[in-house]
Every structure is written in C-alpha cells, then in structure tokens.
C-alpha cells in the first residue's frame, strides 16, 4: 500500500503545483511598484506581469493592458514567458506519463516497465519545477538588483509581486510531488509487496512428503 499512497500524494501535490504555476504565469503581479517617495503628486501602483501590466490609481481605478508587442518586452520577460509556458506544457505531458505509470491504471502492463514510466513521470515533474524556478529567481534577482541600484529612480523601483510567491510555492509542490512519485516508483520496483493492493492467490506448494496438507481436503 506504501507506494500507492506515495503515488497518489505525489500526483495531488503535482496537480496543485501545476495549477499554481498556471496562475503565476497568468497573473500580472510579478513586479509591483515600491512606494518610497511620499512626494509623488498622484500615488499609483504599477503591476507588471509576463503578458500585461496594470496601473491602479489612487482613486481605485484599475486599468490593465496586454503588451503591445513581444519586441517591446525586455529579454528577461521574453525568456520568462518561454520557460514558464514550457514548464506548464511539460507538466501536462508529465500528468499523462504519470497516469500511464500509475498502479491503478492499465495503460502499461504491471512490472518493471510500468515502474519506469511512473519514475519518468516523477522526473518530468521535478524538471518542471526546476524549469519554472529559473525565470522566478531571475526576475527576483533583477528586482533586487534594480531596487538597490542608486541609478534607478525612486518611482521606478519594484518589489516582488504575489505571482512570484505563488510561483515559488508551485515549484516547491512540483518538486516535492515529483520526488514522491519517484519514491513511489522506486519502492514499487524494489518492494512489490508495498505496491497497490491487487491480491493474487498463489498455488500452494506440496509438503516435503509430496502430499498436500490435509486441511486442503474437504
């Protein structure tokens, strides 16, 4: 039962992580303006994401607009888009691989091959987490570097947006879930007795005398 529990828990974590990654990818809050200058005539918050940016005026009026062109974006936003979308799509592929290798499905015949498929699913989820972690940390690095750069104007300094935190949580879930799936597959190959509880009744072996146990006779 152990490996099945690991498998189910791992898959649940990966699915939640995948959802979080999609959310982080779509949210326009990767960077949020930091309020450091109290002399600004009209306070407004600017949110920047991978696909659009939003401006929230002091009145509460919010306006969001999709970027005019991919070309108008900085290289890191273009790279972050590519890596995050790749991670989301790879997680989708990983889901089918994991389901094919799951002990509760019959896509692949039980045995070492099925365990290898399950292991591949886990590794793919692990890789998804790492792939998504790159743009998140890259963005965070830029935000920190520009925040402390004396050349950056006060009204152009940004802080981490909620999307970064959601993204980090999602990558953690993907990596932990991926590890659990790998462990489940590993346990399954090494200890078949801990796998999904499908009971097969093995034939009784004859006793040393060559006779069957008397209890077997009615």
């Amino acid at each position: 039962m152990g490996s099945a529990a690991l498998e189910i828990l791992g898959l649940v974590l990966c699915l939640v992580g995948w959802g979080g990654l999609i959310l982080a990818c779509g949210l326009p809050m990767w960077q949020v303006t930091a309020f450091l200058d109290h002399n600004i005539v009209t306070a407004q918050t600017t949110w920047k994401g991978l696909w659009m940016s939003c401006v929230v005026q002091s009145t509460g009026h919010m306006q969001c607009k999709v970027y005019d062109s991919v070309l108008a974006l900085s290289t890191e936003v273009q790279a972050a888009r590519a890596l995050t979308v790749s991670a989301v799509l790879l997680a989708f592929v990983a889901l089918f691989v994991t389901l094919a290798g799951a002990q509760c499905t019959t896509c692949v015949a039980p045995g070492p091959a099925k365990a290898r498929v399950a292991l591949t699913g886990g590794v793919l989820y692990l890789f998804c987490g790492l792939l998504a972690l790159v743009p998140l940390c890259w963005f965070a690095n830029i935000v920190v570097r520009e925040f402390y750069d004396p050349m950056t104007p006060v009204n152009a300094r940004y802080e981490f947006g909620q999307a970064l935190y959601i993204g980090w949580a999602a990558t953690a879930l993907l990596m932990v879930g991926g590890c659990l799936l790998c462990c489940g597959a590993w346990v399954c190959t090494g200890r078949p007795d801990l796998s999904f509880p499908v009971k097969y009744s093995a034939p009784r072996r004859p006793t040393a005398t060559g006779d069957y146990d008397k209890k077997n006779y009615v």
């Epitope: 920047k48 940016s53 401006v55 306006q63 607009k65 970027y67 005019d68 062109s69 070309l71 108008a72 974006l73 900085s74 290289t75 890191e76 936003v77 273009q78 050349m151 950056t152 104007p153 152009a156």
Partner: antibody
Amino acid sequence: QVQLKQSGPGLVQPSQSLSITCTVSGFSLIRYGVHWVRQSPGKGLEWLGVKWSGGSTDYNGAFKSRLSISKDNSKSQVFFKMNSLQADDTAIYYCARGLDGYYVPDVWGTGTSVTVSS
Amino acid sequence: DIVMTQSHKFMSTSVGDRVSITCKASQDVSTNVAWYQQKPGQSPTLLIYWASTRHTGVPDRFTGSGSGTDYTLTISSVQAEDLALYYCQQHYSTPLTFGAGTKLELR
C-alpha cells in the same frame, strides 16, 4: 534620474548623412527600447523608428531605406544614422525611452536641432 | 498609416477653467492613445497613456478618456504652467503617429 543626452552635428550638407548618439542614464538598454522621433514646423512629430531592448529594430516604412539604428548596451549608447538628407529633413531629432512593453515613448531626450543646408 | 486628427490648432482658456482637447483616429485604436505636453523650447513629456492612465507624477487635474476613434484630454482647472502644446499619439500599431498638436493659450 532617467536621462537621455544627445550629441550630433547642427548642420548637414544636402545628400550627406546624419549621425546622432543618444547616451542614456538611469536605466538599462537591456530592459528598455529607445525610440527616435523628429519634429519639424511643416510635418509636426514624426516617428522614425525604435531599437528594442532585445536588439531588434522597427522602422517607419517611409524612412526604412535610409535609416539605421544600432546600440552598444555596455556604453549605454544608441546610434542613429540617416542617409541622403534633403532640406525637408531639417528638424529637431529626439531619442526617447520606450514605456516597458508598449509603443509609448515616455521620457524624451534633449533633442538635436539639425539644419540641412549647403 | 493611422492618421490622428486634432481639430483645434489653438484653444483659448483662462486660469481655473475646464478645457477639453480632442483627437480623432482614422480607425479604431482601442484605447491605445497617449497624450504629450510640450512647453516652448522643451522636449515633449508624457501625460497619459492607454487613453486614461496618468503617467507617474502627472497631476490629477489631467484626465484622459475615449474609446474607438474619439479621444479627449481634459484639464479640470487650468494652471498657468499648463499653457503649452498638446499632442495625441496612437500606440496601436507601427508606424506610431501623432496629431498635429493643439496650442493652449490664455484668452
């Protein structure tokens, strides 16, 4: 403080080329694009082209054949070159930083007044 | 190319007045409009983008509105320092195009 300082000749001979250097400070050319716009009494404001942060360039079709925009990220400089100038190219030439992600010049340079005359 | 038309070359006003400067696009630019202010001998400065979003540090007496092909820049209470040239610009597609400008002057 975001600044764009321009340097270039004030007078250009007809059929000669114009070269302007835009030196930026307060932001990085790796993160922001730089637009070029000119202003003349007869034609008003005309957008000439833009050098994007990623290195690609967009030109106004009307000037594409005689316009070249390049940059040096390490020196924070953008170079503008226009060939075959005529009298009607007399204008003030501006470089301007692009609003991140949009076709909007948000901070404009000091401007270079160019007269095409022999 | 998209043509931006500012119907008034000049607009007369008094300090404290409410004034509206209009701009018409030759096609739908779906709120991709910016407004600039230019004072004599100076470079243009961005006031409004996305038709209604004020640029950082722009006083809230400046408001932008409009959709489709018709856009307006409104100054709720004109100050002496607001007397300048105002240009609209579309950022819907390249080449970017500007209006001919409207000069705001004292009555």
